[in-house]
C-alpha cells in the first residue's frame, strides 16, 4: 500500500464574518494508526485548533465520524468565524506513540481569509465653528474590515471632493483593518443646508456602500450683516430706528441699542425669519424721543452673534427744529440726516 498522503484540496477559502468555515482534509490510507490534529500556522508556535484524540473544542465540529477506524475524511467546520480566525490551517496526521504521538505527515495548508464588513463610517468636523471662505477639515473613520482593499470617497452636496488624504492601518498583514481619511472643505455662505458625505465601498458590501454624513450646519457660522435705518415719524417728537440683522447662522444672537454710547436696551433674538439658504433674519427697532435730546444723537446697533466679538452699525440723528405743519396731528420732528456708518 502506498504511503499515506494528507490532502487539503482547498489552497484558500474566504468566509464572511459570522458564518462557518469548512476546512477539508482527507487521507489516502488508514495506516499508520494515529490521530489527526488541526493547527493554525506552522512551526513551534502553531495553535491547536482541533485534536481528534482529546480536548474540548466548542466551535469545531467534524464533518465525519472521526471515532471510526475506517474514516478517511478529517474535515472540520469552525462556527461563528471572526477576523481573528484568519490564517493558514494545517491538517496533520500523527502516528500513535509514547510518550507522545509522532507527527507523520502534514497537509499543504488551507488559507482562511475572513471577509468582515467595515463599520458605519463616522464623520466628524472641527471642534469650533468657522466662517465662509475658511477651509475646514472633516475626518471619516471606519473599522474592522477585511480584506484590506477598500475605497473611500468624499462628497459635498453630491459633488465629489478631491482634496483629501486617506490611510488604511495597519500597513502589514492583520486580521482586520481601519481606514482614516481627512478632507478639506471650503465653506461658503450657502452651506448651512450642505452635507459632507464619506462613502466607503468594500467587497463585503456587495456594491451597496456605507455612508457617513456631517451637516455643515454644525460647522458653519455665517456672521450677520447689519443695516440701521430711520423710519418715518411715528408720533410727535419720536423717531423709529430699525436695525436689520440679515443672513446669520446659527440663531444665537443678542442685540444691544446704544444712544450716544449708553446702553438703551438689550434683547435676545426671537421670532426669526428663515431664509431659503438656512440663514436667519431679524429686525429690532428703537423709538427715540427726539425732544429729550438737544444735540445730535448717535444710535448704535450692536450685535453679539454666537459668542463672537460684537459687530455694530451706527446711525446719526440730527436734532434741529422744524415748524409745525398746519393741520398735522404729528410734528414733523427734527430734521433727520443719515450719517455714514462708523
Amino acid at each position: 500500500e502506498e504511503e499515506l498522503q494528507v490532502i487539503q484540496p482547498d489552497k484558500s477559502i474566504s468566509v464572511a464574518a459570522g458564518e462557518s468555515a469548512t476546512l477539508h482534509c482527507t487521507v489516502t490510507s488508514l495506516i499508520p494508526v494515529g490521530p489527526i490534529q488541526w493547527f493554525r500556522g506552522a512551526g513551534p508556535g502553531r495553535e491547536l485548533i482541533y485534536n481528534q484524540k482529546e480536548g474540548h473544542f466548542p466551535r469545531v465540529t467534524t464533518v465525519s465520524d472521526l471515532t471510526k477506524r475506517n474514516n478517511m475524511d478529517f474535515s472540520i467546520r469552525i462556527s461563528n468565524i471572526t477576523p481573528a480566525d484568519a490564517g493558514t490551517y494545517y491538517c496533520v496526521k500523527f502516528r500513535k506513540g509514547s510518550p507522545d504521538d509522532v507527527e507523520f505527515k502534514s497537509g499543504a495548508g488551507t488559507e482562511l481569509s475572513v471577509r468582515a464588513k467595515p463599520s458605519a463610517p463616522v464623520v466628524s468636523g472641527p471642534a469650533a465653528r468657522a466662517t465662509p471662505q475658511h477651509t475646514v477639515s472633516f475626518t471619516c473613520e471606519s473599522h474592522g474590515f477585511s480584506p484590506r482593499d477598500i475605497t473611500l470617497k468624499w462628497f459635498k452636496n453630491g459633488n465629489e471632493l478631491s482634496d483629501f488624504q486617506t490611510n488604511v492601518d495597519p500597513a502589514g498583514d492583520s486580521v482586520s483593518y481601519s481606514i482614516h481619511s481627512t478632507a478639506k472643505v471650503v465653506l461658503t455662505r450657502e452651506d448651512v443646508h450642505s452635507q459632507v458625505i464619506c462613502e466607503v465601498a468594500h467587497v463585503t458590501l456587495q456594491g451597496d456602500p456605507l455612508r457617513g454624513t456631517a451637516n455643515l450646519s454644525e460647522t458653519i457660522r455665517v456672521p450677520p450683516t447689519l443695516e440701521v435705518t430711520q423710519q418715518p415719524v411715528r408720533a410727535e417728537n419720536q423717531v423709529n430706528v430699525t436695525c436689520q440683522v440679515r443672513k446669520f447662522y446659527p440663531q444665537r444672537l443678542q442685540l444691544t441699542w446704544l444712544e450716544n454710547g449708553n446702553v438703551s436696551r438689550t434683547e435676545t433674538a426671537s421670532t426669526l425669519t428663515e431664509n431659503k439658504d438656512g440663514t436667519y433674519n431679524w429686525m429690532s427697532w428703537l423709538l427715540v424721543n427726539v425732544s429729550a435730546h438737544r444735540d445730535d444723537v448717535k444710535l448704535t446697533c450692536q450685535v453679539e452673534h454666537d459668542g463672537q466679538p460684537a459687530v455694530s452699525k451706527s446711525h446719526d440723528l440730527k436734532v434741529s427744529a422744524h415748524p409745525k405743519e398746519q393741520g398735522s396731528n404729528t410734528a414733523p420732528g427734527p430734521a433727520l440726516a443719515s450719517a455714514a456708518p462708523l
Epitope: 500500500e1 490510507s29 488508514l30 495506516i31 494508526v33 494515529g34 490521530p35 481528534q52 484524540k53 482529546e54 472521526l66 471515532t67 471510526k68 477506524r69 475506517n70 474514516n71 500513535k96 506513540g97 509514547s98 510518550p99 507522545d100 504521538d101
Partner: antibody, heavy 118, light 107 residues
Framework: EVQLVESGGGLVQPGGSLRLSCAAS????????MHWVRQATGKGLEWVSV???????YYPGSVKGRFTISRENAKNSLYLQMNSLRVGDTAVYYC????????????WGQGTMVTVSS | DIQMTQSPSSLSASIGDKVTITCRAS??????LAWFQQKPGKAPKSLIY???SLQSGVPSKFSGSGSGTDFTLTISSLQPEDFATYYC?????????FGQGTKLEIK
C-alpha cells in the same frame, strides 16, 4: 447490525493444528484492523495477533512462529491458523475489531473454545 | 513488553457505591489505554478508549482518566448489572497487553 462470529474451535492433541474463523457482518471489513484475543479458563485476557488493513501482522512471543493470522476481505472473514499447539494454548479465542480511530477494540465475537489435550 | 498492573485484584461494594479501579503501566503509554467489562461466560465488552473516551452506547456512570503510566476507571453509582470483572489494556504498541483484571463483587 455489526457482528463477529467465531468458529472452528474444538479438541486437538498437543502438536496438532486448528484453523479458527471469524465471520464479520454489518461493516466494511476491509477497512478495519482485526485481532485475536484468548482467555484461559478462570484467567485473564491475552492478546494473540493482529492483521492490519494492509495485511501487516504482529504476534506476541508466546505464539510467534506457530500461529498465522490472515484475512479474506472478499468473504469478510478473519482466520487464525494454529500449529504446534500446546496444552497452554487451551482457551476461549475471541476475534475483536480495532474499530476506534486508534485501533481500540470496540466489537468482540462471542468466542470459540479450543482445548489442547492428549 | 509493557506490563499492566491493576489494583485491587478484587473489590466488594454495595449498590449505589462509587468505586475506583486503578491501572499502572510499566512505561509511558501516552493515553492509549482501554477498559473492558466481562461477565462470566460472556465476551468482554468495550467501555473506554484513549483513557477517557466512552465507547458508543456505554452509560456515563463509567468514566476514565489518566495519562502516561497511571489510570483510573470510576463507576459512579453501582447497579446490580455492574458486578463483573474489569480489565485494562494498553494498545500503544505491540504486543498489546492486558491487566490481570479486577473482580467487582457485591457486598
Amino acid at each position: 447490525e455489526v457482528q463477529l462470529v467465531e468458529s472452528g474451535g474444538g479438541l486437538v492433541q498437543p502438536g496438532g493444528s486448528l484453523r479458527l474463523s471469524c465471520a464479520a457482518s454489518g461493516f466494511t471489513f476491509s477497512s478495519y484492523d482485526m485481532h485475536w484475543v484468548r482467555q484461559a479458563t478462570g484467567k485473564g485476557l491475552e492478546w494473540v495477533s493482529v492483521i492490519g488493513i494492509a495485511g501487516d501482522t504482529y504476534y506476541p512471543g508466546s505464539v510467534k512462529g506457530r500461529f498465522t493470522i490472515s484475512r479474506e476481505n472478499a468473504k469478510n472473514s478473519l482466520y487464525l491458523q494454529m500449529n504446534s499447539l500446546r496444552v497452554g494454548d487451551t482457551a476461549v479465542y475471541y476475534c475483536a475489531r480495532g474499530g476506534s480511530w486508534d485501533d481500540a477494540f470496540d466489537i468482540w465475537g462471542q468466542g470459540t473454545m479450543v482445548t489442547v489435550s492428549s | 513488553d509493557i506490563q499492566m498492573t491493576q489494583s485491587p485484584s478484587s473489590l466488594s461494594a454495595s449498590i449505589g457505591d462509587k468505586v475506583t479501579i486503578t491501572c499502572r503501566a510499566s512505561q509511558d503509554i501516552n493515553n492509549y489505554l482501554a477498559w473492558f467489562q466481562q461477565k462470566p461466560g460472556k465476551a468482554p465488552k468495550s467501555l473506554i478508549y484513549t483513557a477517557s473516551s466512552l465507547q458508543s452506547g456505554v452509560p456515563s456512570k463509567f468514566s476514565g482518566s489518566g495519562s502516561g503510566t497511571d489510570f483510573t476507571l470510576t463507576i459512579s453509582s453501582l447497579q446490580p448489572e455492574d458486578f463483573a470483572t474489569y480489565y485494562c489494556q494498553q494498545y500503544v504498541s505491540y504486543p498489546y497487553t492486558f491487566g490481570q483484571g479486577t473482580k467487582l463483587e457485591i457486598k
